[in-house]
């Protein structure tokens, strides 16, 4: 049953004289193992004998014997799966049909394989992509329908006969599906590769040439251009002529259009390979190139920078920066279109030439107010001198200058006056917009820069003002010099340091804290009576009668000021003691008699002592001695003694007469 035999192998194998063939092969015999195998060359079936006739290249039998001449052909298979064969070397006359005659116990099969052996190594085949574009990576493939384990080969790539630098990847296939050797080369062709010959060379293991295939590269690319200009340096003067020519070195496919560009913009009606510029103007300076297009895209030449030279144009001045702050640095830049660039500059300030300034830039490291004004310049190159442009204005800003505080009042100023001050300045940029005053007070500003102080205080010593724009400038403080009557007049005891005792030497000082003007007069007064005109009031020996309320007055040309009343207290021992009797010095017995010890003392008497006519002290110590009821025996002379912290004083004797009552007389 033939359906039981299934074979897989390449349909045809290719080789050349002296090489080898390796025939990958698999089979399946479903009824058991292979018992006999014969490899025929060009087998033909003989109907008479019911057998195949042909050259037997290989034969294996049950006993496994193989004739010795069969070493060239090897059966590398087995009894149930593998039918791989090798012929080494292979000869030209091996070409034709190989027949694998397989026999199992019950079945037979003839499998045919084509073998194509050439006289010389056949060439590989180069495969190219359908289109190749410059700079786009492509894969070149070199394919050879040959591979054999016993005959190593290599494929090498050449460009115009020179080995290519790019690394190729070689792969081989020896499978039942296909037998080949393949080399793949990744390559980014440039436009210059167009028309060049690429070769894939088949070599043996020693690098000996066997065969090759060649292709001509057709690299699609945009037109490649060259540009030429007359004059060659592309530097001309206004009115000269310029010619530019564009040459196409290569284009694939054919170019279709040509145009010229200036600074990237297409020039109208310029569609030939020559650009003629007659009587050029400075506006025609710029970067020129030609552009030629084909189906791949536009190609551009290198740029030619055409310089049309001309004398400087009227100049303008750029100021970095205006307005400028006084003290800052400022740079002036003279800007003038010219070709070639100006080599010399003349600078003007307010129309007057600035000496020694010949550069494009003028740098002023420290700007002052007088630097303000109009700056202009003139540029000069080899073709001539430009005109002076309108110039630029430098505005120098600074704080207000020479600020002064001015008192508007007639002098002198007296305490309580209304004072008007003004804040003046010499110059300011920008204008003064506000004023400040020191010290701050609840004062009126009736108009800008004027200060009114109502009821000026004696202690308003100095005032300063500031005029402000973007900055504030302070004036030196001005002294108001307010005149006022003496202040804080008071009486001060200089001596004695302790309390005043009668008989002491006493000095009182009339003090004041301040006075303006300084020239003063003093007045001392006691109970409305003028005592002296010096600053001190002196008592050589003070007496109790000097005690009392004292005031001093200090006056200057503005006015006079009195001190608070000051009480002068004189301490003295009790004096002028006398004993007074109530109801009188004659009292009837049985009645009541009160003796009072009267005295003058400072401080008051703190302790009294009573004495009788015998100078006997009585056991009474209060100011009053009360005798009740009075007896005749009480009659006699009494005196008292008063004591205070200063000393003692005694009274003269005072006689008390106690007479008998009518009752006593009646009893007698």
């Amino acid at each position: 049953d033939s359906s039981k035999w299934v074979f897989e192998h390449p349909e045809t194998l290719y080789a050349w004289e002296g090489a080898c063939v390796w025939i990958p092969c698999t089979y399946r015999a479903l009824d058991g193992d292979l018992e006999s195998f014969i490899l025929f060359h060009n087998p033909e079936y003989n109907k008479n004998t019911s057998k195949f006739d042909g050259t037997r290249l290989y034969e294996s039998t049950k006993d496994g014997k193989v004739p010795s001449e069969q070493k060239r052909v090897q059966f590398l298979g087995d009894k149930n799966k593998n039918c791989t064969l090798s012929i080494h070397p292979v000869h030209l006359n091996d070409s034709g049909q190989l027949g694998l005659r397989m026999e199992s116990k019950t079945e037979k099969w003839m499998e045919r394989i084509h073998l194509n052996v050439s006289e010389r190594p056949f060439p590989p085949h180069i495969q190219l992509p359908p289109e190749i574009q410059e700079s786009q990576e492509v894969t070149l493939t070199c394919l050879l329908n040959f591979s054999c384990y016993g005959y190593p080969i290599q494929l090498q790539w050449l460009l115009e006969g020179v080995p290519m630098r790019q690394a190729a990847v070689t792969s081989t296939s020896l499978t039942i599906k296909s037998v080949f050797t393949r080399s793949e080369l990744k390559f980014s062709p440039q436009w210059s590769h167009h028309g060049k010959i690429v070769t894939c060379q088949l070599q043996d293991a020693d690098g000996k040439f066997l065969s090759n295939d060649t292709v001509q590269l057709n690299v699609k690319h945009t037109p490649k251009l060259e540009i030429k200009v007359t004059p060659s340096d592309a530097i001309v003067r206004e009115g000269d002529s310029v010619t530019m020519t564009c040459e196409v070195s290569s284009s694939n496919p054919e170019y279709t259009t040509v145009s010229w560009l200036k600074d990237g913009t297409s020039l109208k009606k310029q569609n030939t390979f020559t650009l003629n510029l007659r009587e050029v103007t400075k506006d025609q300076s710029g970067k020129y190139c030609c552009q030629v297009s084909n189906d791949v895209g536009p190609g551009r030449s290198e740029e030619v920078f055409l310089q049309v030279q001309y004398a400087p144009e009227p100049s303008t001045v750029q100021i970095l920066h205006s307005p400028a702050v006084e003290g800052s640095q400022v740079e002036f830049l003279c800007m003038s279109l010219a070709n070639p660039l100006p080599t010399n500059y003349t600078w003007y300030h307010n129309g007057k030439e600035m000496q020694g300034r010949t550069e494009e830039k003028v740098h002023i490291p420290k700007i002052l107010p007088w630097h303000a004004g109009t700056y202009s310049c003139v540029a000069e190159n080899i073709l001539g001198t430009g005109q002076r442009g309108p110039g630029a204005e430098l505005d120098v800003q600074y704080p207000p200058k020479k600020v002064t505080t001015v008192i508007q009042n007639p002098m002198p100023i007296r305490e309580g006056d209304t004072v008007t001050l003004s804040c003046n300045y010499n110059s300011s940029n920008p204008s003064v917009t506000r004023y400040e005053w020191k010290p701050h007070g609840a004062w009126e500003e009736p108009s800008l820069g004027v200060l009114k102080i109502q009821n000026v205080g004696w202690d308003n010593t100095t005032i300063a003002c500031a005029a402000c724009n973007s900055w504030c400038s302070w004036a030196s403080p001005v002294a108001l010099n307010v005149q006022y009557a003496p202040r804080d007049v008071r009486v001060r005891k200089i001596k004695p340091l302790s309390e005043i005792h009668s008989g002491n030497s006493v000095s009182l000082q009339c003090d004041f804290s301040s006075s303006h003007p300084k020239e003063v007069q003093f007045f001392w007064e006691k109970n409305g009576r003028l005592l002296g005109k010096e600053s001190q009031l002196n008592f050589d020996s003070i007496s109790p009668e000097d005690a009392g309320s004292y005031s001093c007055w200090v006056n200057n040309s503005i006015g006079q000021t009195a001190s608070k009343a000051w009480t002068l207290e004189v301490l003295y021992a009790p004096r002028r003691l006398r004993v007074s009797m109530s109801p009188g010095d004659q009292v009837m017995e049985g009645k009541s008699a009160t003796l009072t010890c009267e005295s003058d003392a400072n401080p008051p008497v703190s302790h009294y002592t009573w004495f009788d006519w015998n100078n006997q002290s009585l056991p009474y110590h209060s100011q009053k001695l009360r005798l009740e009821p009075v007896k005749v025996q009480h009659s006699g002379a009494y005196w008292c003694q008063g004591t205070n912290s200063v000393g003692k004083g005694r009274s003269p004797l005072s006689t008390l007469t106690v007479y008998y009552s009518p009752e006593t007389i009646g009893r007698r």
Epitope: E247, V248, S250, S251, P253, V258, T272, F273
Partner: nanobody
């Protein structure tokens, strides 16, 4: 379609001169690289001379260098070949052709897309 018509050929004695003209129809002639080729009986076509559109690039074959001069007038869409010191070997049909592939391919006939019919030049001894 570009059409080219040659004129100026004829019979001339060796050492003599001829001036060939090639007129193109349409403006595209002015942007084409123009070449002259010749073909003698029984011989392959041979490159003679080529001129770029601007006239800035000119190429001659070694066999005519110093004797022939190629020029062009783009305003007239015309290319000229001034042939001096003619030799018997110069006998051939002279054909003008237009190329839009650039001067690197000026001597490669296969890169010329448009061809004239040719004009016969015969140099006698």
């Amino acid at each position: 379609q570009l059409q080219l018509v040659e004129s100026g050929g004829g019979l001339v004695q060796a050492g003599g001169s001829l001036r060939l003209s090639c007129v193109g129809s349409g403006d595209r002639v002015s942007i084409a690289l123009m070449g002259w080729f010749r073909q003698a009986p029984g011989k392959e076509r041979e490159f003679v001379a080529a001129i770029s559109p601007s006239g800035g690039r000119i190429t001659y074959s070694d066999s005519v260098k110093g004797r022939f001069t190629i020029s062009r007038d783009n305003a007239k869409n015309t290319v000229y070949l001034q042939m001096n010191s003619l030799k018997r070997d110069d006998t051939a049909v002279y054909v003008c052709a237009a190329n839009f592939r650039g001067y690197l391919s000026s001597s490669r006939g296969s890169d010329y897309a448009y061809w004239g019919q040719g004009t016969q030049v015969t140099v006698s001894s």
